[in-house]
Interface confidence: low
């Protein structure tokens, strides 16, 4: 809305007007003049600045000007005031009209002004404090110099006895809940009362009503009552003008994450409305606007420090649990066990949820994204994670069928990367999909749209449908290089496995046994020689390597990686009835990364000189980088059910120190 307005005077009348600081008033003196008038003069209070504008040229008028101006259609007045009035109608402008002859005015028009200051303020400079009347507050820009306020989706549950997230209702039960909201201050300054016929209104658009909620603390002195004033069915709220210098504090919560058809931007407006007459709508004479961007949901890559590790307790995974516990004890984080009453026999905790976070300058907290998979762990995120300063979000398809690709072993994120000069300081999301044109499985559109809409971790689609389970964590992971900001991409490689096995065969270890010491499997006595002589297995793994290479090329291109950034971990797959791949031996790339400590599926590879040659090989690749390898036996509790260590664990990590609003997507 233009920051200026026209006030119509009428000769023989006194007009009351409210002047909002920063909004010049234009007065058409010509239309207000009596027919006989030819010239006019002006008088005005000291606190009013008046300019006569003729044909675009402005001339300032002295306080009690004797000067007369010729009346013409192109002559208008421009009024400005520098400070708020202390009393209503205490400032005035008088226009005297003259005919051709006389010196005395033939008529007069009076404008009685009440100057008030109205400013709807937010933390537009993103320093965690609401500043006063930031000129950039109505727009939103990215980058380190960017301006515009930020809003969190209030998706945690600060009141434990409530069934859902805080943003699911229009109530505030605690001050803790308010801390998740962004502050907005309506500052007013002026006389004790306004002239009759004015009303101040806060409002939002219909399209924003399901995306933002606004609360007001009614009684900050005695026991507080939090009133929901905007959002959902409430599109506007009349604000009582209190007089003097006043600051009304509002709390704003996000209700929806950015998504398809919603950029994440919402605006809140305050208007001063003027009453004309019965049956005539109020008209806005001033509008101030603030714009918020709803903070995106951000995923955390392996390079970030862990806070807690989650794992399910099953009837058959006691030893696995013990090994994970030992690994976690080495790191500075806690182990959280999801017991059977909660997991109800579902061990795949990686597939049920993805940990991320949201952040604003004043606050941030972890948020779990619940997958549409909804296995027997489906109650876990809401019952065990959702809580004070721990948010929850989900996306469920309405018409699409949920497939294995909708599990979150198929949702990963890279460390920060630079691609052809473009930086992704929060990394890029990686999801598995089907081969172009193959008509195979694909992650459901609602989740893909959600991830895309967050903007800060531009997703990359990989090809994972060649796998039985079809998850990206079956062929890739990232590891940090301790003490640096660098990382390595680890990729499963059948070529690397064949190369290693051939080397061992050449060295005379062709009869080295895989799966040694494991009941059922070792009875088949699988040796290096047997693996290498199995033509169909070799052919299958050549095909699987092509699939891996297809992904390798995508990752190099989309993450700006070179061959030096990639480490190949030996892997073998075998084809199932549906011509898709499942791991032949525990798939080492499906590991858990906890700082420098890696929990790697124990591959039970060929025993060469009392040691597993796969373990030795992997240690040789990773330990020189400063990483510590712990091989975890998951074969009976996970591998045989088509998953490994990563699939059976989940890690809540610390957020990035980098602020998402400093980037330019």
């Amino acid at each position: 809305m233009p920051r200026e307005r026209t006030v119509r005077l009428q000769y023989g009348s006194r007009v009351e007007a409210v002047y909002v600081l920063g909004t010049p008033l234009w007065i058409d003196v010509y239309s207000a003049a009596p027919a006989e008038a030819r010239t006019f003069s002006l008088k005005h209070s000291e606190r009013v600045r008046v300019e006569v504008v003729r044909d675009g040229e402005a001339e300032e008028v002295a306080t009690n000007g004797k000067q007369r101006w010729l009346l013409s259609p192109s002559t208008t007045l421009r009024l400005t005031m520098g400070q708020a009035s202390t009393e209503a109608s205490s400032d005035k402008v008088t226009v005297n009209y003259y005919d051709e002859e006389g010196n005395a005015p033939i008529d007069q028009a009076g404008l009685f002004l009440t100057a008030i200051e109205i400013s709807l303020d937010v933390d537009a400079d993103r320093d965690g404090v609401v500043e006063k009347n930031n000129p950039q507050k109505a727009s939103w820009t990215w980058g380190p110099e960017g301006q515009g306020a930020i809003l969190l989706v209030n998706c945690d549950r600060d009141t434990p006895w409530l069934p859902k997230e805080d943003c699911s209702d229009e109530k505030v039960y605690s001050k803790e809940d308010l801390k998740d909201m962004s502050q907005m201050i309506l500052r007013t300054k002026g006389p004790d009362r306004l002239p009759a016929g004015y009303e101040m209104v806060l409002y939002i658009s219909v399209s924003d009503s399901d995306k933002v909620g606004v609360f007001y603390v009614e009684n900050p002195f005695f026991g507080q009552r939090y009133i929901h004033i905007l959002g959902r069915r409430k599109l506007y709220h009349v604000v009582k003008y209190t007089g003097g210098s006043a600051e009304l504090l509002f709390f704003v919560e996000g209700l929806r994450f950015p998504d398809e058809g919603f950029s994440g931007l919402v605006s809140i407006h305050v208007s001063l409305l003027e009453y004309m007459a019965e049956e005539v709508p109020l008209t806005p004479i001033f509008t101030d606007t603030v714009t918020f961007r709803i903070a995106p949901w951000i995923m955390t890559p392996n390079i970030l420090p862990p806070v807690s590790v989650f794992v399910c307790c099953m009837k058959d995974n006691y030893l696995f649990l013990k090994e994970v516990k030992n690994l976690v004890e080495k790191t500075n984080c806690e182990l959280k066990v999801c017991f059977q009453y909660m997991n109800r026999g579902d061990r795949w905790i990686q597939d049920e949820i993805e940990f991320g976070y949201i952040e604003a300058p004043h606050k941030g907290f972890p948020v779990v994204l619940d997958s549409p998979r909804d296995g027997n762990l489906k109650d876990f995120p809401i019952k065990q994670l959702l809580g004070p300063d721990f948010g929850y979000v989900t996306r469920e398809p309405v018409f699409e069928t949920v497939t294995s690709l909708d599990s979150f072993g198929n949702l990963e994120v890279s460390p920060p990367v630079t691609v052809n000069g473009k930086t992704y300081p929060l990394g890029r999301i990686l999801i598995g999909s089907s081969f172009p044109l193959s008509g195979g499985r694909r992650m459901t559109k609602v989740v893909r749209d959600f991830l895309q809409a967050q903007q800060v971790q531009a997703p990359v689609e990989l090809y994972s449908d060649w796998l039985t389970v079809g998850h990206v964590d079956e062929f890739m992971t990232f590891v940090p290089i301790p003490g640096t900001t660098q990382f390595r991409l680890l990729m499963a490689s059948t070529a690397a496995c064949y190369k290693l096995f051939r080397e061992k065969q050449k060295e005379g270890h062709g009869e080295a046994i895989l799966f040694k010491g494991l009941g059922g499997m070792s009875s088949k006595r699988i040796t290096i020689n047997k693996v290498l002589s199995n033509e169909s297995l070799a052919q299958e793994n050549q095909y699987f390597q092509r699939c891996l290479d297809w992904n390798r090329d995508i990752l190099k291109k989309e993450l700006g990686l070179t061959e030096q950034d990639i480490i190949d971990l030996p892997a073998l797959f075998k084809m199932d009835e549906g011509r898709q791949a499942r791991a032949f031996f525990p798939n080492m790339v499906n590991m858990i990364v906890l700082n420098k400590d890696l929990g790697i599926p124990k591959p039970f590879g060929p025993q060469v000189e009392e040691e597993c040659c796969l373990e030795t090989h992997v240690r040789g690749l990773l330990e020189p980088l400063g990483l510590a390898c712990t091989f975890i036996d998951d074969i009976s509790a996970y591998h045989k059910f088509l998953g490994e260590v990563h699939c059976g664990t989940n890690v809540h990590r610390k957020p990035f120190t980098f602020k998402w609003w400093h980037m330019v997507p």
Epitope: T159, S174, F222, G223, R225
Partner: antibody
């Protein structure tokens, strides 16, 4: 159901201090202000002060500003009032009372049974 | 602070009689709450926000008033109504009236 439990009686020497307790149950302790009210034998009610258990923000009747100190222990859902430098004037029944801003227009909807404090040597 | 004066200090009533207890303020109060205190027990909320009955309170009790004058009416006194009645305002700092003792003849 909502209950505010207070000990029945306290006998205190003049000049000493006493810390009265009020254990809340049956509701979310941190969601309601806790008030303390004094009633001398055969007399009316006097508001002493109140505390918000969620953050210990408190307000006092000026007459009790130097006499009473209100605190809470959230972990045990207990409100406390310490009375210091006791004199015979402080002999009274002291009630804790929950204040409901939502359902009862700011009235005190639940009261403890009261603790009778006797100041005597 | 607002001073509340209750009258009468003592009221003796017969069973079935209608009675009115009054509470006047030395300056305008937003609204009034009323409490009943039976001998040896803690006060119990009777009426809140001038005219609203607290839960479980018999409908023979009613409240009214505004500004500086408020009243509590019992339409038909019963034996169990013998008690002290206190008015209470929460404008500025909270205060209570001195109380009215209701005795049954």
């Amino acid at each position: 159901q909502v209950q505010l439990q207070q000990p029945g009686a306290e006998l205190v020497r003049p000049g000493a201090s006493v810390k009265l307790s009020c254990k809340a149950s049956g509701y979310t302790f941190t969601s309601y202000w806790m008030n303390w009210v004094k009633q001398r034998p055969g007399q009316g009610l006097e508001w002493i002060g109140m505390i918000d258990p969620s953050d210990s923000e408190s307000y006092y009747n000026q007459m009790f500003k130097d006499k009473a100190t209100l605190t809470v222990d959230k972990s045990s859902s207990t409100a406390y009032m310490q009375l210091s430098r006791l004199t015979s004037e402080d002999s009274a029944v002291y009630y804790c009372a929950r204040k409901d801003y939502y359902a009862y227009g700011g009235a005190m909807d639940y009261w403890g049974q009261g603790t009778s404090v006797t100041v005597s040597s | 602070q607002i001073v509340l004066t209750q009258s009468p200090a003592i009221l003796s009533a017969s069973l079935g009689e209608e009675i009115t207890l009054t509470c006047s303020a030395n300056s305008s109060a937003r609204y009034m709450h009323w409490y009943q205190q039976k001998s040896g027990t803690s006060p119990k909320l009777l009426i809140y926000s001038t005219s609203n009955l607290a839960s479980g309170v018999p409908s023979r009790f009613s409240g009214s008033g505004s500004g500086t004058f408020y009243s509590l009416t019992l339409s038909s006194v019963e034996a169990e109504d013998a008690a002290d009645y206190y008015c209470h305002q929460w404008s500025g700092y909270p205060t209570f009236g001195g109380g009215t003792k209701l005795e049954i003849k």
